[in-house]
């Protein structure tokens, strides 16, 4: 049993039939000594009297708000959660496993550029009694400060039948050096509590593999006279880490016809224009990766040829 | 070239250099990233790589300062690394084609490296390991996890340089 | 903390095969090196084989080659250990263990030198 | 194969005494990837030095290793009640990774 927080205690259980549970032992945070009576969550039952209360966890019957009285006045609680440990595996029955970029994925990230600051996002299908922490930091065994914020409702979606949640929180690095190269990684810790269940998540990476550009910014097409090409060109993004001369990227322009089936004609380039052939009906797109780390490209900017 | 004095460095021949190394660290392991190769460190874990950290002057405003500092780790780095790729964890069973792009990085690191370094200078460098692995197999993981960290070195490297050759040279 | 949690003794024929089981939880799996073991009763300790699962490809003991299979489940995180045409003589407890860490440079790979063990299971092979 | 030849196969000591275990490998050892286990009835090996001499995480300071080549040494320089078991030494420098066969050390 540990402290999640103050009056907030997780007990780790061994989950399998007939298992022994945990031997627990409640104390009154009370100066008083006698006619202490204990009850669990709004019953009225008397579960024990005295100072201290112990008793066997075995099963989410067995959780909840422990509270000790003396004639009628609350003294104080004990809130008791469960994190189940089966066939030597953390349950992780709260998120959901978004399977990329492999399995057993729940905690996903993403960084704009590299000022230090990053979201991360998870999935859930699970609508009520949800809470969610997140704590952060660089490097583990001396660690340096990341500050995150509240996790937040940030997307509902309909899969099938059924509704999923996504929720997301923005974390910053205390002392960010976007120029240094990483070498302890950034670590995400979640802890979820649904009802009386406890789990936690974590994800580790550095930020150099979690940078996803914006989309490139202004693309415009300026024609070739009597040519069917035309000169496209686009800006940084404004999100994107200064000054460009050292936090390059570099680009994709594809040409793509109206129909899915015809060809894709595609140019990179480190410049931030291109010259290529519209076709009717085509549509020019350009996106963004870092110029020198293959992390992510940006999601598409696009215009159309006519 | 780097000369201790101070002078600069042939910022736009390092730059096209050092975005070659960039893309033949990548080709010569492209799906490293999707690998778990993360690092656990114990009580006996010591970490000898040279990395460019944030004191080492690389950021925009250390160069226009003095590229010195910047210049002398990145070369370090590179001796390193040339060292590593010459070592037999790249040398050794499971063989590489000659062709390969570890090949042509491992020279490239080398060209680099002196165009940095003038004869008869010599900043000091970091020593690899003498331990060396006995199965294929640790040396197979070791070449992942060195090439990514490889990777990430030189990305910072390639900025320095392209920065340097947009407002730095003369 | 770190542990190896193997399955259950088994009781087996003959001629049958037995498939031993070992969950990791915490640490790194993919790039451990995890090793089976043997101990037949009141003999010495025999290395079977082993296998990195971020590689899938596992290494035997030739005295085992053909007759031992080593897999594992990244997603899991368990290793697998399976010996078919089981004779009396495999009768042992069968550990399962994982490599400890060297370091190379600032790059840590694993030894063959086993610091964490499972519980062992113990297999017999009786008619 | 390389064999380890572990000797004596038992040694009957009392608490306080220093042992001396020996390990002889039938070729050379390379880079010194020798290990040395102790092991418990009913209990699963536990690693006390790997790399010949190095002392593995909370291994306590009477235990030590030395040599190199084919010859290995595994020394407790007093013993402790705890330090009565079985020994083996590991060579991890060609497959298949093996074992000598024991050194039991027992209570005199």
């Known amino acids: 049993i540990w402290e999640l927080k103050k009056d907030v205690y997780v007990v780790e259980l061994d989950w399998y039939p007939d298992a022994p549970g945990e031997m627990v032992v409640l104390t009154c945070d009370t100066p008083e000594e006698d006619g202490i009576t204990w009850t669990l969550d709004q019953s009225s039952e008397v579960l024990g009297s005295g100072k201290t209360l112990t008793i066997q966890v075995k099963e989410f019957g067995d959780a909840g708000q422990y509270t000790c009285h003396k004639g009628g006045e609350v003294l104080s609680h004990s809130l008791l959660l469960l994190h189940k440990k089966e066939d030597g595996i953390w349950s992780t029955d709260i998120l959901k496993d978004q399977k990329e970029p492999k399995n057993k994925t729940f905690l996903r990230c993403e960084a704009k550029n590299y000022s230090g600051r990053f979201t991360c996002w998870w999935l859930t299908t699970i609508s009520t009694d949800l809470t969610f922490s997140v704590k952060s930091s660089r490097g583990s065994s001396d660690p340096q400060g990341v500050t995150c914020g509240a996790a937040t409702l940030s997307a509902e979606r309909v899969r099938g039948d059924n509704k999923e949640y996504e929720y997301s929180v923005e974390c910053q690095e205390d002392s960010a050096c976007p120029a240094a190269e990483e070498s302890l990684p950034i670590e995400v810790m979640v802890d979820a509590v649904h009802k009386l269940k406890y789990e936690n998540y974590t994800s580790s990476f550095f930020i150099r593999d979690i940078i996803k550009p914006d989309p490139p910014k202004n693309l415009q097409l300026k024609p070739l006279k009597n040519s069917r090409q035309v000169e496209v060109s686009w800006e940084y993004p404004d999100t994107w880490s200064t000054p460009h001369s050292y936090f390059s990227l570099t680009f994709c322009v594809q040409v793509q016809g109206k129909s899915k089936r015809e060809k894709k004609d595609r140019v990179f380039t480190d410049k931030t224009s291109a010259t290529v052939i519209c076709r009717k009906n085509a549509s020019i797109s350009v996106r963004a990766q870092d110029r020198y780390y293959s992390s992510s490209w940006s999601e598409w900017a696009s215009v159309p040829c006519s | 070239r780097a000369v201790p004095g101070g002078s600069s460095p042939a910022w736009t021949q390092c730059q096209q250099l050092s975005q070659k190394l960039c893309t033949l660290a990548w080709s010569a392991h492209p799906l490293v990233g999707h690998m778990d190769l993360r690092e656990e460190g114990d009580e006996e874990t010591t970490n000898d790589v040279p990395h460019i950290q944030c004191g080492d002057g690389c950021d925009p405003q250390g160069l226009r300062d003095n590229s010195q500092f910047c210049l002398q780790r990145i070369h370090q780095g590179l001796i390193f690394y040339e060292k590593l790729l010459g070592s037999d964890i790249f040398t050794g069973e499971p063989s590489l084609l000659p062709d390969s792009p570890v090949a042509q990085l491992h020279a490239s690191l080398l060209g680099l490296s002196q165009l940095l370094q003038p004869e008869g200078h010599h900043w000091e460098t970091q020593q690899i390991p003498s331990l060396s692995p006995s199965q294929p197999w640790q040396r197979l993981l070791l070449r992942f996890k060195i090439l990514r960290s490889l990777q990430a070195f030189v990305a910072v490297a390639a900025r320095v340089f392209a920065h340097g050759a947009a407002t730095l040279s003369p | 903390q770190v542990e190896l949690v193997q399955s259950g003794a088994e009781v087996k024929k003959p001629g049958s095969s037995v498939k031993v089981s070992c969950k990791a939880s915490g640490g790194t799996f993919s790039s451990n090196y995890i090793s089976w073991v043997r101990q037949a009763p009141g003999q010495g300790l025999e290395w079977m084989g082993g296998?990195?699962?971020?590689?899938?490809?596992?290494n035997y003991a030739q005295k085992f080659q053909g007759r031992v299979t080593i897999t594992a489940d990244e997603s899991t995180s368990t290793a697998y250990m399976e010996l078919s045409s089981l004779r009396s003589e495999d009768t042992a407890v069968y550990y399962c263990?994982?490599?400890?860490?060297?370091?190379?440079?600032?790059?840590?790979?694993?030894?063959?030198?086993?610091?964490?063990w499972g519980q062992g299971t113990l297999v017999t092979v009786s008619s | 194969d390389i064999v380890l030849t572990q000797s004596p196969a038992t040694l009957s000591l009392s608490p306080g005494e220093r042992a001396t275990l020996s390990c002889r490998a039938s070729q050379s050892v390379s880079s010194n990837y020798l290990a040395w286990y102790q092991q418990k009835p009913g209990q699963a090996p536990r690693l006390l030095i790997y790399?010949?001499?190095r002392r593995a995480t909370g291994v306590p300071a009477r235990f030590s290793g030395s040599g190199s080549g084919t010859d290995f040494t595994l020394t407790i320089s007093s013993l402790e009640p705890e330090d009565f078991a079985t020994y083996y030494c590991q060579q991890t420098s060609n497959t298949p990774f093996t074992f000598g066969q024991g050194t039991k050390v027992e209570i005199k």
């Open positions: 790399y010949a001499s």
């Open positions: 296998i990195i699962p971020i590689f899938g490809h596992a």
């Open positions: 263990a994982r490599s400890k860490k060297g370091m190379y440079g600032g790059w840590t790979y694993p030894l063959m030198m086993f610091d964490l």
